[in-house]
């Protein structure tokens, strides 16, 4: 059962797993949710009736019955983890805590103009978990405007105290806002020889990498596969760190694999849930339950629905036994990983899928592409919106993409002659323009933010943001697309699609059904050759077939050039301009979104 509300002046008795410090009950609930075993918590707020050393304590708790006795206690706030809930969960915490000093290891001290600058510094520092900033009103002159970057073993403060004229907050890496480089490759036959901060058992290097990603101290990892010569180390996942944030050295070793935490990758690949099945593999751990199940898929469902289950092993039925049902062993451990992994016993193992909802909304799996054909199906491009103008009459004006729950990214040239945001309507979850009737719900536009260097599409900066009057509730038919990370500038995208309701040829009309076309990217050098009269800058990206035939056209403007990379869709381009439509040797020119990520973040995060 999902219980989201907090219980004031209430303490849960017993079931303690560990105590951490958090600046608020709300954040205590998030920490509990991400902890492998925590189901309930009790937070102690600051209060004259409480011992100050107990202020801000967050006691994480577990219970076999999923609940604990309640006791009245002033200043105690209790609640349940969101593990029991089906809604999207995020570790992202943008809150700034006034007059709180979050204690940790102060490893970097520098002057910053504002708390926001200090938070950005923390977000872009590989080791930083949280920060404390002394404001210009801070009593001690030499400490004013000092930004202290901090880290701890757990990622949460070791203590929190009241301190006037300081503010504290957390790194926004988990908000996918870091500009740190992101290394996604896994390096075979490689051991990174740096400090181990922890070790867990994992069935493969990908799971090891995902565990590293959401471990607060892990920056890179080494995994010993099941063929590793030393039996006691097989399936061992070593979580590592170093002062520089990168491995100081690497050792070549057969049957070992190494890689990096994806904490700075704007979560552009799912990092929490391990959805694969591991055949002929048994996961050992504390047994929660043994139930009969028809298949390993059914066993995984049972594990996902049992809130305390972390992983499982399914042993298929012996012929004609138990109505063809096998045994499903639901298991757990202190850290969420198997205590041992055995091979060759015939079991099929896997993990709970309840952690999948902890991934960034933009990484959520959407309907598979329909291969062939040009008409889209419902839910195929859930970030695509149709932007309508109501003046002089209502019509489709441009495409756009949902990039946040209040933000649409589109092209600046769409707003030529648009005097006011009041005449604009954004429709999401639309497949056919004919669905839009007088009573169809839409999002009003609060503000149009056009790049201040924009003059005309052909000279670049053809980018604009629409701030919506109300927030978008994410569903299967309307959800955001991931922005590319600045660390991904080197990615070569091979699966790119342009979508829109635009013309299918130069002299045509707006299409009723959302159209799609798979289009290859073209290098800027090649593109420049095709447009000798224009300057193709690095802030533009081109796509098209040399022979023409498929392209964006009038009415597609502002819509997405969506590219799939590592199973996740990225907004690589915004439809901008081109010579005619689908002409031979005239690729379409798109705004290169990765070059505007800073601008987008600056505008969307402005208070």
């Amino acid at each position: 059962e999902c219980v989201t509300q907090l219980l004031k002046d209430t303490c849960f008795e017993g079931g303690d797993i560990t105590t951490v410090f958090t600046p608020s009950a709300k954040y205590c609930q998030v920490v509990c949710t991400y902890h492998p075993r925590c189901l309930l918590f009790t937070f102690t707020a600051e209060s004259p009736s409480e011992d100050p050393t107990r202020w801000f304590t967050c006691v994480l708790k577990d219970s076999v019955t999923e609940t604990l006795p309640r006791v009245n206690r002033t200043a105690a706030i209790s609640g349940y983890s969101f593990k029991q809930c089906s809604h999207q969960i995020s570790a992202c915490n943008k809150d700034i805590y006034v007059d709180l000093d979050m204690k940790g290891i102060n490893y970097n001290s520098s002057v910053a103009k504002s708390a926001q600058e200090c938070q950005e510094r923390c977000t872009d520092d590989v080791h930083c978990h949280f920060f404390t900033y002394a404001t210009r009103q801070f009593p001690s002159l030499e400490h004013r405007n000092i930004c202290l970057l901090k880290h701890t073993q757990t990622g949460t403060p070791t203590r929190i105290t009241k301190l006037d004229k300081v503010v504290s907050g957390f790194s926004l890496k988990s908000c996918a806002l870091s500009n740190l480089a992101c290394i996604r490759d896994i390096f075979p036959n490689t051991v990174f020889a740096d400090s181990n901060i922890d070790s867990v058992m994992a069935p493969d290097a990908f799971v090891c990498g995902r565990i590293c990603t959401h471990h607060p101290g892990c920056l890179f990892f080494t995994f010993f596969s099941q063929e590793w010569p030393k039996e006691s180390q097989r399936n061992l996942c070593l979580l590592k760190t170093s002062e520089s944030g990168l491995p100081s050295t690497r050792i070549k070793k057969s049957k070992a694999l190494s890689g990096f935490s994806l904490q700075s990758c704007r979560h552009s690949i799912p990092v929490f849930c391990h959805s694969s099945f591991y055949h002929d593999t048994d996961f050992l751990g504390e047994e929660l339950d043994i139930v009969a199940a028809k298949s390993h898929e059914a066993c995984q469902k049972l594990c996902t629905n049992a809130v305390r289950c972390q992983f499982f092993t399914y042993t298929p039925a012996q012929a004609s036994c138990n109505e063809g049902k096998g045994k499903c062993y639901l298991k757990l451990s202190s850290n969420g990983s198997p205590t041992k992994i055995l091979h060759g016993r015939g079991g099929i193992s896997g993990y709970t899928l309840r952690l999948c909802k902890m991934d960034n909304e933009c990484t959520t799996k959407i309907k598979p592409r329909i291969v062939g054909g040009t008409a889209s199906v419902r839910g195929e491009w859930p970030w695509q919106v149709t932007l309508h103008t109501t003046s002089p009459t209502q019509r489709h004006l441009c495409g756009g993409s949902i990039i946040g729950n209040q933000w649409i990214l589109t092209a600046a040239h769409c707003f030529y002659g648009v005097e006011s945001p009041k005449i604009l309507r954004v429709y999401s979850g639309i497949l056919n323009q004919s669905e839009i009737k007088e009573d169809t719900s839409f999002f009003g536009v609060q503000e149009i933010i056009i790049h201040d260097q924009y003059k005309m599409a052909e000279s670049g900066y053809d980018i604009a943001l629409l701030k919506l009057e109300t927030t978008v509730n994410y569903t299967d038919s309307q959800r955001p697309i991931c922005l590319p990370s600045k660390g991904d500038r080197n990615v070569i995208y091979t699966d790119c699609w342009v979508t829109g309701w635009g013309y299918r040829k130069l002299r045509d009309k707006i299409q009723n059904t959302l159209q799609k076309a798979k289009i290859p990217l073209v290098t800027n050098e090649e593109c420049q050759k095709r447009y000798r009269g224009h300057k193709i800058t690095h802030k533009m990206i081109c796509a098209g077939y040399r022979e023409g035939g498929k392209d964006a056209c009038k009415g597609d403007s502002g819509g997405p050039l969506s590219c799939k990379h590592n199973e996740v869709w990225h907004l690589v381009g915004i439809t901008s301009w081109g010579e005619g439509c689908a002409q031979r040797e005239r690729p379409g020119v798109y705004t290169n979104v990765v070059e505007y990520v800073d601008w987008i973040l600056e505008k969307t995060q402005a208070v």
């Epitope: 996604r184 490759d185 896994i186 075979p188 990168l246 050295t249 050792i251 070549k252």
Partner: antibody, heavy 125, light 107 residues
């Protein structure tokens, strides 16, 4: 067939920064299967590894040169570069770029299988 | 750093001779060793990788053996084009290091 070509000034003044670029043709630098390396050879002497870079930007340097070396990669130009600061006469050498195979298929095919022809750099005032 | 010691530093041999060059690592490197051939004014050329695997296009008269700390490059029947300097290289651990080289000269 992949080919590498070093380019950069042949003469550098002491205390200045030596800058060389290696252009990769006939194949993409964008591959997890390779590191891209710089090696030098002092006149009449053996080979000295300077450092390597992966397309992702992951670098390894020779500790004896680490404080002075920066290797970078530009996947859009299919190039990688070497910068060696505060040079002295002891940095006079033939500088080679090479492809270091680190095969992602894990079949243990390793070694520097493609080399540039080398460029002579003299440090002198 | 792992030191790679090659011996001999030079060897005089005739066409048709069998030539053996040894390379010793200051610590175990499993089989992470390569052999290169370098001719004057030219870049090195990869002959052997993983201690004993022949690089494609390299004549079969070249062979490598060894594991751990002791390695050998053998040219079974020396040809005129084989007169050059040979280097071993370990890539077990960064920094990558090369042996001092063995010059194979005409007798």
């Amino acid at each position: 067939e992949v080919q590498l070509q070093e380019s950069g000034p042949g003469l550098v003044k002491p205390s200045q920064t030596l800058s060389l670029t290696c252009t990769v043709s006939g194949g993409s630098i964008y591959s997890g299967a390779y590191y891209w390396s710089w090696i030098r050879q002092h006149p009449g002497k053996g080979l000295e590894w300077i450092g390597s870079i992966h397309y992702s930007g992951l670098t390894y340097y020779n500790p004896s040169l680490k404080s002075r070396v920066t290797i970078s990669v530009d996947t859009s130009k299919n190039q990688f570069s070497l910068k060696l600061s505060s040079v002295t006469a002891a940095d006079t050498a033939v500088y080679y770029c090479a492809r270091d195979v680190d095969d992602s298929s894990g079949d243990e095919h390793y070694g520097m299988d493609v080399w540039g022809q080398g460029t002579t750099v003299t440090v002198s005032s | 750093d792992i030191q790679m010691t090659q011996s001999p530093s030079s060897v005089s041999a005739s066409v048709g001779d069998r030539v053996t060059i040894t390379c010793r690592a200051s610590q175990g490197i499993d089989s992470w060793l390569a052999w290169y051939q370098q001719k004057p004014g030219k870049a090195p050329k990869l002959l052997i990788y993983a201690a004993s695997s022949l690089q494609s296009g390299v004549p079969s008269r070249f062979s490598g053996s060894g594991s751990g700390t002791d390695f050998t490059l053998t040219i079974s029947s020396l040809q005129p084009e084989d007169f050059a300097t040979y280097y071993c290289q370990q890539y077990h651990i960064v920094p990558i290091t090369f042996g001092g080289g063995t010059k194979v000269e005409i007798k």
